[in-house]
Interface confidence: low
């Protein structure tokens, strides 16, 4: 079966947002991946969501992220942006209205958008072959 | 328990260098982003530069650029600044900080005074 065109979006979305680092993405974020064994796709999606939901709530305006230059400024801009368009699509293929974050590990935003990309690049691979 | 720890502070003259370092201890020092913020007296708080865990990409305030670098050595556990053509302005508290821009962890602060 054809692969869903919102995670071909995702996957757009994590390559433009691991192509550059911001001031902003060493900061951490809870590390759902941690110990996700007896959690379903949908749940780990959702719960991504919620986690990069947090993260661009917490910071879109926080003037440390923004940095001191017009190019630190727009690269934060576009992070948050790019964040957002994530978190919609993610919502979308997860299905669930809400879930929980409860995990006590971290995880540097950079570190997760990575480990986001290698799941969804496998699950794209199973459904495009 | 998480430790930063800087030193090199000092009284400076104008056009004067010095070189501040943090010793980091606690936490996995090569996989977060470190920085330098500073406080001069009677002002708030302002971000100076900011460096990657991998060392490979490093921030500035427009105020340091130019003047001041930052550096790592991963291996030491040490985050460095090395402040050139110092100013007066320059004379504040220097605090080392893990994590910049959520600032979860400071050390106690170096005292620059550049002063003739």
């Known amino acids: 079966h054809k692969c869903d065109i919102t995670l071909q979006e995702i996957i757009k979305t994590l390559n433009s947002l691991t192509e550059q680092k911001t001031l902003c993405t060493e900061l951490t974020v809870t590390d759902i991946f941690a110990a996700s064994k007896n959690t379903t796709e949908k749940e780990t999606f959702c719960r991504a969501a919620t986690v990069l939901r947090q993260f661009y709530s917490h910071h879109e305006k926080d003037t440390r992220c923004l940095g001191a230059t017009a190019q630190q400024f727009h690269r934060h801009k576009q992070l948050i942006r790019f964040l957002k368009r994530l978190d919609r699509n993610l919502w979308g293929l997860a299905g669930l209205n809400s879930c929980p974050v409860k995990e006590a590990n971290q995880s540097t935003l950079e570190n997760f958008l990575e480990r986001l990309k290698t799941i969804m690049r496998e699950k794209y691979s199973k459904c495009s072959s | 328990e998480v430790q930063l720890l800087e030193s090199g502070g000092g009284l400076v003259q104008p056009g004067g260098s010095l070189r501040l370092s943090c010793a980091a201890s606690?936490?996995?020092?090569?996989?977060?982003?470190m920085g330098w913020v500073r406080q001069a007296p009677g002002k708030g708080l302002e971000w100076v530069s900011f460096i990657t865990s991998s060392g490979l990409s490093t921030y500035y305030a427009d105020s340091v650029k130019g003047r001041f670098t930052i550096s790592r050595d991963n291996s030491k556990n040490t985050l460095y600044l090395q402040m050139n053509s110092l100013r007066a302005e320059d004379t504040a508290v220097y605090y080392c900080?893990?994590?910049?821009?959520?600032?979860?962890?400071w050390g106690q602060g170096t005292l620059v005074t550049v002063s003739s």
């Open positions: 606690g936490f996995t020092f090569e996989a977060y982003g």
């Open positions: 900080a893990k994590s910049l821009g959520r600032f979860d962890y």
